[in-house]
Interface confidence: low
Amino acid sequence: LPKAPVITTPLETVDALVEEVATFMCAVESYPQPEISWTRNKILIKLFDTRYSIRENGQLLTILSVEDSDDGIYCCTANNGVGGAVESCGALQVKMKPKITRPPINVKIIEGLKAVLPCTTMGNPKPSVSWIKGDSPLRENSRIAVLESGSLRIHNVQKEDAGQYRCVAKNSLGTAYSKVVKLEVEVFARILRAPESHNVTFGSFVTLHCTATGIPVPTITWIENGNAVSSGSIQESVKDRVIDSRLQLFITKPGLYTCIATNKHGEKFSTAKAAATISIAEWSKPQKDNKGYCAQYRGEVCNAVLAKDALVFLNTSYADPEEAQELLVHTAWNELKVVSPVCRPAAEALLCNHIFQECSPGVVPTPIPICREYCLAVKELFCAKEWLVMEEKTHRGLYRSEMHLLSVPECSKLPSMHWDPTACARLPHLDYNKENLKTFPPMTSSKPSVDIPNLPSSSSSSFSVSPTYSMT
């Protein structure tokens, strides 16, 4: 008798490993014999597809080598023309041993930054990821976390984080290990022991010590009054990432000695500096404010204002006088916001000659202040309006720093060129005669508070200087 098909063994969920065989069984009772078709995710599986084997009159479907893309719902449908077609469905769950798809790589990182070591995995069930540092499992803490992706994130990297790391991916089917990678922590150069200042007698030997550390170990160079050390012997030793440098000097003149520690991080360098002064006991006259030395001006800001190869006074109350005084000029110019074309060259000349004062070499190098008359010319004539604005801002506390207070001289405290013509310095850029005055527009309605005497004439034009920095 004809009998409609009945599926006697419904399909079940099948778990299969990648590259293994997976079989679905769809046992059917019917008369006449049914036609059985198979679908995966509702798409018909073709009989001639070589990845599958269909046997036992279609009742057995075998996937010959499972791939992870074979995941899905498989259905068999039986029909023999008697009654309706019947269907049974089951899932194929492709199980997969853990696989590390993006392994960690060697990392170099600067101390204090954030490091991320990747470890992206595949697998079913989803693998859990842990990390090994050296030979021990890595313990998470408030800086070190394994992220959901499996990556290892280290905040505020410390020296002790350096070492060998590997990630481990684990599920019920197995374990995968990444190759071992290296985390290298680089540390900016840092001076541990700065050289000490000495006051010695002429002809003494002095040893300056400078100790620095960093990763990689820094190199140490010594600078004497802004130039590479020309005399003296240097001894160095390195132990446990600490470099110790000793500079032995035979003292015949005072000087500023700077120890510079430098190390390299990729394309960038980090440096640390420390300075010491060597003074000679017999030379130290009681001139409290005049601690410094004469040197040629080698900066940029005042290049166009100071005479070529000008000998300027460098104040050793700063650790790095050239840099500090250059910064003072720069800051002062930037803080004088609105400056007229008439005022600008005059202000530049005044600032440069005030901060980099002419230097009188001798037993005690001495700075030569600007003559009062030139200072007043800038204040009351060339820059009257601007000076008022600046003084008002100073009183109202609108400046970001106190630096500008050092940058602008108090004219009344400067020596007059009538007292002693050699005791003060002139500003050649401001020399003018009465004819020149007629060309300037009036800049203040009030009469200058101090009579500005005639300044000596000069054959050079009044404003031959072109500013290196704009003050606007």
């Epitope: 998470e140 408030s142 976390a145 959901e148 905040h155």
Partner: antibody, heavy 118, light 108 residues
Framework: QVHLVQSGAEVKKPGASVKVSCKAS????????MHWVRQAPGQGLEWMGW????????SYAQKFQGRVTMTRDTSISTAYMELSRLISDDTAVYYC???????????WGQGTMVTVSS | SYVLTQPPSVSVAPGQTARITCGGN??????VHWYQQKPGQAPVLVVY???DRPSGIPERFSGSNSGNTATLTISRVEAGDEADYYC???????????FGTGTKVTVL
């Protein structure tokens, strides 16, 4: 918008347990530690511990070891703090807090008042 | 365990500068964070990693840290700055977070 929203106030008897929840939104919950901090009335802040929502790893302050359990449910981006064997000194506001990319706590829950009274 | 000590209270007139200290053994080697807490509210981070400010925190709040003392400075103090302030560090040796004792800032 990043938010941590905590469960409502609780009143418990001494010896009982309390479980406070903290639901995160606006950021990847599993990417950052969740900390718990408490503050007794008129007192300062006291750190209780943290949980790594991804791995479930925890670290508890010595004082609460054995009494506190921190758990999480990543499917609903929620962290839990359970404190057992309550005493009256546990009366406090309990906060959850997290640090999104920095080691400080830059996001806090609104706090949950837990009162322990017989 | 690591201890952070703060003065219980600091009083300051509007427009003046308030300085709150946080003392701890060699605290200069640690990152210090500062929180402001107003009555009935959750704490708010005002300075982290010694001197960095989260977005939205005024420039009037600044921090420094060296030796055995960290300092939170509030310049040009306003009435709205009246609150409790807490310092906090992560103690590497115990892997625990530690809060300071707290300082009440009163604007006169």
């Amino acid at each position: 918008q990043v938010h941590l929203v905590q469960s409502g106030a609780e009143v418990k008897k001494p010896g009982a347990s309390v479980k406070v929840s903290c639901k995160a939104s606006g950021y990847t919950f599993t990417g950052y530690y969740m900390h718990w901090v408490r503050q007794a009335p008129g007192q300062g802040l006291e750190w209780m511990g943290w949980i790594n929502p991804y791995s479930g790893g925890t670290s508890y302050a010595q004082k609460f070891q054995g009494r506190v359990t921190m758990t999480r449910d990543t499917s609903i981006s929620t962290a839990y703090m359970e404190l057992s064997r309550l005493i009256s000194d546990d009366t406090a506001v309990y906060y959850c807090a997290s640090g999104l990319g920095i080691s400080a706590f830059d996001i806090w829950g609104q706090g949950t008042m837990v009162t322990v009274s017989s | 365990s690591y201890v952070l000590t703060q003065p219980p209270s600091v009083s300051v007139a509007p427009g003046q500068t308030a300085r709150i200290t946080c003392g701890g053994n060699n605290i200069g080697s640690k990152s210090v964070h500062w929180y402001q807490q107003k009555p009935g509210q959750a704490p708010v981070l005002v300075v982290y990693d010694d001197s960095d400010r989260p977005s939205g925190i005024p420039e009037r709040f600044s921090g420094s840290n060296s030796g055995n003392t960290a300092t939170l400075t509030i310049s040009r103090v306003e009435a709205g700055d009246e609150a409790d302030y807490y310092c906090q560090v992560w103690d590497r040796s115990s892997d625990h977070y530690v809060f300071g004792t707290g300082t009440k800032v009163t604007v006169l």
